[in-house]
């Protein structure tokens, strides 16, 4: 650690005195202190001498000697008082700049330690300090305002009692800066804009920050726009607003608009797109297939995306048949707005009944006209089967009718014994009918097919079974010949009640 001579913590001298402060260290040493007049600094080997032959009140201060090469960074200090009866204060700063909640040191140094008892801090022109100003005093350093607030940004003076009267220092301006958390906050409205050529438009770019020192500008396709700026201060924030007003838009006004704000912490930007169109438009689309197939009893949501400008004047869902004249319940229709010009309309169809198959149309209207988007909803059903014994052209024939959607496939089985359903061990013969006759096939209805199995003689201890299946399920009907005639037997589990 360097050593200062004279080896006293503080030195009191009169104005005009010669002061010599010597600092000695192991290596080179440096003096540090407030830049002030009349000092001479010179080196003598491993010592450095700070001297003046005409000390003034301005030389009052703490002088520190450091050894730059010392890794421990040791230092020694001496405080010099130049006791001037006419000048109780040496003010080391015109201005003090701190951030909010930091301690603010107002460097009024007493030139005479004896005056410490009668010091006080005031605002200029003798005004008292603001309420809740918490401060302390050190004769070496001055007044410290603890946890300074923005509102305490004022001009202050230090006061000392000399011979019963108060003597003021020159003023010190305290600037308490707001802590800037980051770049200014930005808003650009609207987020998207569409206008028909000739209409008016407005784009507003605004930025706000706790500190007034920030810049904001609006640019169109990378060209900075010259727009007058409106400034405001509310909710403890500074606001700067740029408003672009266009009375009659044209195609050259279209494009990308960016709102950019910057301060010492960095830059923020946000963008929007302005579209100029020739006339009103209304576009309907769906991400879904317009032809829908759903199993009976299940639910379905039909979704339509609408892109429109100007806004919609009306919209509704309509059931176009063919089963009934019922209309979708309004409570099942839902509308959500993605943004100003895009909306999604959903029709919820829970637990679909056979009478709800058919065409559903979404209609929308705006000044550009009407548009419609129609979905076709077909219900899927598992097959229903029935078998009868008949004679066709004199031949005994088993006739199987299967009804369902999609169109069922038909398989005949002959098995030993009397049973409700043939199992593998009993099967004697299997016939696939690849092309059953289609009896009815109307849109949105079940498809009914018929399959014929010509049987020369019915074996009485055997069962004939017609099985039908499609993507939804399967159904079967067992035919058991008995001496008194024929007996048909649909298995219980395949009875179907929608």
């Amino acid at each position: 650690i360097p050593v200062i001579e004279p080896s006293v913590p503080e030195l009191v001298v009169k104005p005009g005195a010669t002061v010599t402060l010597r600092c000695v260290g192991n290596g080179s040493v440096e003096w540090d202190g407030p830049p002030s007049p009349h000092w001479t600094l010179y080196s003598d080997g491993s010592s450095s001498i700070l001297s003046t032959n005409n000390a003034t009140f301005q030389n009052t201060g703490t002088y520190r000697c450091t050894e730059p090469g010392d890794p421990l960074g040791g230092s020694a200090a001496i405080h010099l008082y130049v006791k001037d009866p006419a000048r109780p204060w040496n003010v080391l700063a015109q201005e003090v700049v701190v951030f909010e909640d930091q301690d603010a040191l107002l460097p009024c140094l007493l030139t005479d330690p004896v005056l410490e008892a009668g010091v006080s801090l005031v605002r200029v022109r003798g005004r008292p300090l603001m309420r809740h100003t918490n401060y302390s005093f050190s004769p070496w350093h001055g007044f410290t305002i603890h946890r300074a607030k923005f509102i305490q940004s004022q001009d202050y003076q230090c006061s000392a009692l000399m011979g019963g009267r108060k003597v003021m220092s020159i003023s010190i301006r305290l600037k308490v800066q707001k802590v800037i958390p980051g770049p200014p906050a930005l808003t650009l409205v609207p987020a998207e804009l569409v206008r028909i050529r000739g209409e008016a438009a407005q784009i507003v770019c605004s930025a706000s920050s706790v500190d007034v020192n920030f810049d904001v500008f609006l640019q169109h396709n990378n060209t900075k726009l010259a727009i007058p700026q409106q400034s405001d201060f509310h909710n403890n924030r500074y606001q700067k607003v740029l408003t672009l007003n266009l009375d009659q838009v044209d195609f050259q006004h279209a494009g990308n608009y960016s709102c950019v704000a910057s301060n010492v912490q960095g830059k923020h930007s946000t963008s929007m797109f302005f579209r100029v169109v020739e006339s009103a438009y209304l576009n309907l689309s769906s991400e879904q297939n317009l032809i829908q197939e759903v199993t009976v009893g299940e639910g379905l949501n039909l979704k339509v995306m609408v892109e429109a400008y100007p806004g919609l004047q009306g919209f509704n869902w309509t059931y176009l048949g063919p089963f009934s004249d019922h209309q979708p319940e309004p409570k099942l229709a839902n509308a959500t707005t993605k943004d100003t010009y895009r909306h999604t309309f959903t029709l919820s169809l829970p637990r679909l009944k056979p009478s709800e198959a058919g065409r559903y149309s979404f209609l929308a209207r705006n000044p550009g006209g009407w548009r419609a988007l129609t979905f076709e909803l077909t219900l899927r059903y598992p097959p229903e089967v029935s078998v009868i014994w008949t004679f066709i052209n004199g031949s005994g024939t088993l006739l199987c009718a299967a009804s369902g959607y999609p169109q069922p496939n038909v398989t005949w089985l002959q098995c030993s014994g009397h049973t409700d359903r043939c199992d593998e061990a009993q099967v004697l013969q299997v016939w696939d009918d690849p092309y059953p006759e289609v009896l009815s096939q109307e849109p949105f209805h079940k498809v009914t097919v018929q399959s014929l199995l010509t049987v020369e003689t019915l074996e009485h201890n055997q069962t004939y079974e017609c099985r039908a299946h499609n993507s939804v399920g399967s159904g079967s009907w067992a035919f058991i010949p008995i001496s008194a005639g024929a007996h048909t037997h649909p298995p219980d589990e395949f009875l179907f009640t929608p």
């Epitope: 003096w31 540090d32 202190g33 407030p34 830049p35 002030s36 007049p37 009349h38 000092w39 001479t40 600094l41 010179y42 700070l50 005409n54 002088y63 520190r64 450091t66 730059p68 960074g73 230092s75 080391l92 700063a93 015109q94 201005e95 003090v96 700049v97 701190v98 930091q102 603010a104 040191l105 460097p107």
Partner: antibody
Framework: QVQLQESGPGLVKPSETLSLTCTVS????????WSWIRQSPGKGLEWIGY???????NYNPSLKSRVTISVDTSKNQFSLKLSSVTAADTAVYYC???????????WGQGTLVTVSS | QSVLTQPPSASGTPGQRVTISCSGS????????VNWYQQLPGTAPKLLIY???QRPSGVPDRFSGSKSGTSASLAISGLQSEDEADYYC???????????FGGGTKLTVL
């Protein structure tokens, strides 16, 4: 060895605020006095102001109304703001460490700031 | 217009001794110490002399400073080509309460 590095925009528009930062390395900013000096072709070297780590500042009277120098000890940086700039503020701006006699022992390499629209 | 006055230019041949003058007033050089700076082309100024006649470590003893009344001078003996630079004087000014500079002298080594 103490090193100083200026940073900030090289071009500022008239009437706007010039903002520069000086980063100190190789030593703590929490001792010594720190300064901004500028050098313009027309006016030579001109002292702008001093700052101490506590935030105490002294400014050149000719610039006082437009200058703010602040310090951020946590980043070992001090900053200059010069408002309402004109073409006359075009200069190379230096940050430096001050001696108590008023001299400057260590300098940054300087940054040219041009004021132009 | 600089507060301290220096000749705009000076020149000398290698090996020669060159002196650069700096003139001020009672509020600066008259009552405070003088510093000299050397600025090589394209670089920042470097402290050459402080407190009238003190050399920082690393500055050759060819450079010396002196002060008398309200004037100061920088002497360079044994002039070398690498001494070609701008030289500035500076001093604390009591009325400004801060340092002032001279306008600079461009030294050319012929």
């Amino acid at each position: 060895q103490v090193q100083l590095q200026e940073s900030g925009p090289g071009l500022v528009k008239p009437s706007e605020t010039l903002s520069l930062t000086c980063t100190v390395s190789g030593g703590s900013i929490s001792s010594y006095y720190w300064s901004w000096i500028r050098q313009s072709p027309g006016k030579g070297l001109e002292w702008i102001g001093y700052i101490y780590y506590s935030g105490s500042t002294n400014y050149n009277p000719s610039l006082k109304s437009r200058v703010t120098i602040s310090v951020d000890t946590s980043k070992n940086q001090f900053s200059l703001k010069l408002s309402s700039v004109t073409a006359a503020d075009t200069a190379v701006y230096y940050c430096a460490r001050a001696l108590l006699t008023g001299g400057f022992a260590y300098w940054g390499q300087g940054t040219l700031v041009t004021v132009s629209s | 217009q600089s507060v301290l006055t220096q000749p705009p230019s000076a020149s000398g041949t290698p090996g020669q001794r060159v002196t650069i003058s700096c003139s001020g007033s009672s509020s600066n050089i008259g009552s405070n110490t003088v510093n000299w700076y050397q600025q090589l082309p394209g670089t920042a100024p470097k402290l050459l002399i402080y407190s009238n006649n003190q050399r920082p470590s690393g500055v050759p003893d060819r450079f010396s400073g002196s002060k008398s009344g309200t004037s100061a001078s920088l002497a360079i003996s044994g002039l070398q080509s690498e001494d070609e630079a701008d030289y500035y004087c500076a001093a604390w000014d009591d009325s400004l309460n801060g340092p002032v500079f001279g306008g600079g002298t461009k030294l050319t080594v012929l």
